[in-house]
C-alpha cells in the first residue's frame, strides 16, 4: 500500500541533492585554502539533520545551528555585497572583483544556491515530489529558514560601507518583502556600518532616469536613516560597461558615467 504523502505547492527537492551538496562542499574547500579543514561529510550530515524527519513547515533557526557551526567563515566585513532580485550580475561582479563577497561566495551560501530541499515528518526520506511554498504553504520551511538564518548572519557580519545591488527594471526596486528588505536591512549593525550604498542597475539601454529618486529607494533611505546608518545611491546605467570597467579600470571609456 503506497504511503500517503503531503502534496505541497512548491517544487520538490532538487534531484541528486545529497550528491550536489557534498560535491559543492568538496569543490569549495579545494578552492578556498582557509576552509580546507572542513569535513564535508560532517557538513552534509549536519545539513541533512536540519530537515530530515522534521515537518517541513516547522523548521527553526536552531535546526541549522550544527550546520552553521561547521560553516563558520570569516568574511572581510567591509567587502560585503548584498543584492536583491539581481543575483547573476552580483555574482558576475564578485567573480571579477575578487575581494568582495556575496553570501553565495561563502561556503554555506555556495552549498545551497539555487537548490530546493525538504523532508517529511517521522521518515528519513527526502521529498523529491514537492516542498512547501513560502506564500502558499508556510514560511517556516527548510529553504526559507536556511536563507533567513545565513542572511541574518551575513548582514550582522558587515561593517564600514556595505553595498547592495538592486534591480532597476522591477516595479519595486526596493522590496520590503525580499530577503534584503525583510532580513538584511534590519540586521545591519549601526555601530559597525557607517553607510549603505545602493547600486541601482538599469535594464534599458536608453534609460537615463535617475532611479535613485524612485519612491521605493526613498523608502529604503528612510528605513536606513532611522537606523542611524548613512545612505547613498548610484545609478548603474550600463551594467555591461560597469562590469567591463571593473575588469579593466584603466580603459579610457571608464572615466565617464556608467
Amino acid at each position: 500500500v503506497p504511503r500517503w504523502r503531503q502534496q505541497w505547492s512548491g517544487p520538490g527537492t532538487t534531484k541528486r541533492f545529497p550528491e550536489t551538496v557534498l560535491a559543492r562542499c568538496v569543490k569549495y574547500t579545494e578552492i578556498h585554502p582557509e576552509m580546507r579543514h572542513v569535513d564535508c561529510q560532517s557538513v552534509w550530515d549536519a545539513f541533512k539533520g536540519a530537515f530530515i524527519s522534521k515537518h517541513p513547515c516547522n523548521i527553526t533557526e536552531e535546526d541549522y545551528q550544527p550546520l552553521m557551526k561547521l560553516g563558520t567563515q570569516t568574511v572581510p566585513c567591509n567587502k560585503i555585497l548584498l543584492w536583491s532580485r539581481i543575483k547573476d550580475l552580483a555574482h558576475q561582479f564578485t567573480q571579477v572583483q575578487r575581494d568582495m563577497f556575496t553570501l553565495e561566495d561563502t561556503l554555506l551560501g555556495y552549498l545551497a544556491d539555487d537548490l530546493t530541499w525538504c523532508g517529511e515528518f517521522n521518515t528519513s526520506k527526502i521529498n523529491y515530489q514537492s516542498c512547501p511554498d513560502w506564500r502558499k504553504d508556510c514560511s517556516n520551511n527548510p529553504v526559507s529558514v536556511f536563507w533567513k538564518t545565513v542572511s541574518r548572519r551575513f548582514a550582522e557580519a558587515a561593517c564600514d560601507v556595505v553595498h547592495v545591488m538592486l534591480n532597476g527594471s522591477r516595479s519595486k526596486i526596493f522590496d520590503k518583502n525580499s530577503t534584503f528588505g525583510s532580513v538584511e536591512v534590519h540586521n545591519l549593525q549601526p555601530e559597525k556600518v557607517q553607510t549603505l550604498e545602493a547600486w541601482v542597475i538599469h535594464g534599458g539601454r536608453e534609460d537615463s532616469r535617475d532611479l535613485c529618486q524612485d519612491p521605493t529607494i526613498k523608502e529604503l533611505e528612510s528605513i536606513i536613516s532611522k537606523r542611524n546608518i548613512q545612505f547613498s545611491c548610484k545609478n548603474i546605467y550600463r551594467p555591461d560597461k560597469f562590469l567591463q570597467c571593473v575588469k579593466n579600470p584603466e580603459d579610457s571609456s571608464c572615466t565617464s558615467e556608467i
Epitope: G71, T72, Q73, I80, L108, R153, E191
Partner: nanobody, 124 residues
Framework: QLQLQESGPGLVKPSETLALTCNVS??????????WGWIRQPPGKRLEWIGS???????DYNPSLKSRVTISVDTSKNQFSLKLTSVTAADTAVYYC????????????????RGQGTLVTVSS
C-alpha cells in the same frame, strides 16, 4: 549568559604600551562557540575595530593598527588581553572587549556581546 569585563590602567604615557585584560564569565573562552575581539571609541568619533582572535588561535588586526597590536588568550584565567604599543594622544578612547558567536559567516568585528568599556587616556 556571557559577560565581559575590561580592566587595566586608565592613564598611559605617550610612547608607552597600553595593556588591557578582558575577563569572561558565563562561558569558556576556549569554547569553539565564540571568538573575541577589541574595539574602541575615541571621544566624539565612531567605534573602531582593533582586532580579533579566533578559536584556532589565529588573529586579525585592523590594518591601520596592525604594527602596534597584539591580542592573546589566557585559557587558565578565562580571559583575553590587548597590547597596543607606542601610544599617542590619538589612542585616547573608551576600549571595549567583545565576543561573537562563532557560526556561519562572521565579520572580523564580534558584536554579540560587549563589555561596559574602560576609558584610557594617553597623556604625560
Amino acid at each position: 549568559q556571557l559577560q565581559l569585563q575590561e580592566s587595566g590602567p586608565g592613564l598611559v604615557k605617550p610612547s608607552e604600551t597600553l595593556a588591557l585584560t578582558c575577563n569572561v564569565s558565563g562561558g569558556s573562552i576556549s569554547s569553539s562557540s565564540y571568538y573575541w575581539g577589541w574595539i574602541r571609541q575615541p571621544p566624539g568619533k565612531r567605534l573602531e575595530w582593533i582586532g580579533s582572535i579566533y578559536y584556532s588561535g589565529s588573529t586579525d588586526y585592523n590594518p591601520s593598527l596592525k604594527s602596534r597590536v597584539t591580542i592573546s588568550v589566557d585559557t587558565s584565567k578565562n580571559q583575553f588581553s590587548l597590547k597596543l604599543t607606542s601610544v599617542t594622544a590619538a589612542d585616547t578612547a573608551v576600549y571595549y572587549c567583545a565576543g561573537g558567536y562563532n557560526y556561519g559567516p562572521v565579520g572580523q568585528w564580534p558584536s554579540d556581546y560587549r563589555g561596559q568599556g574602560t576609558l584610557v587616556t594617553v597623556s604625560s
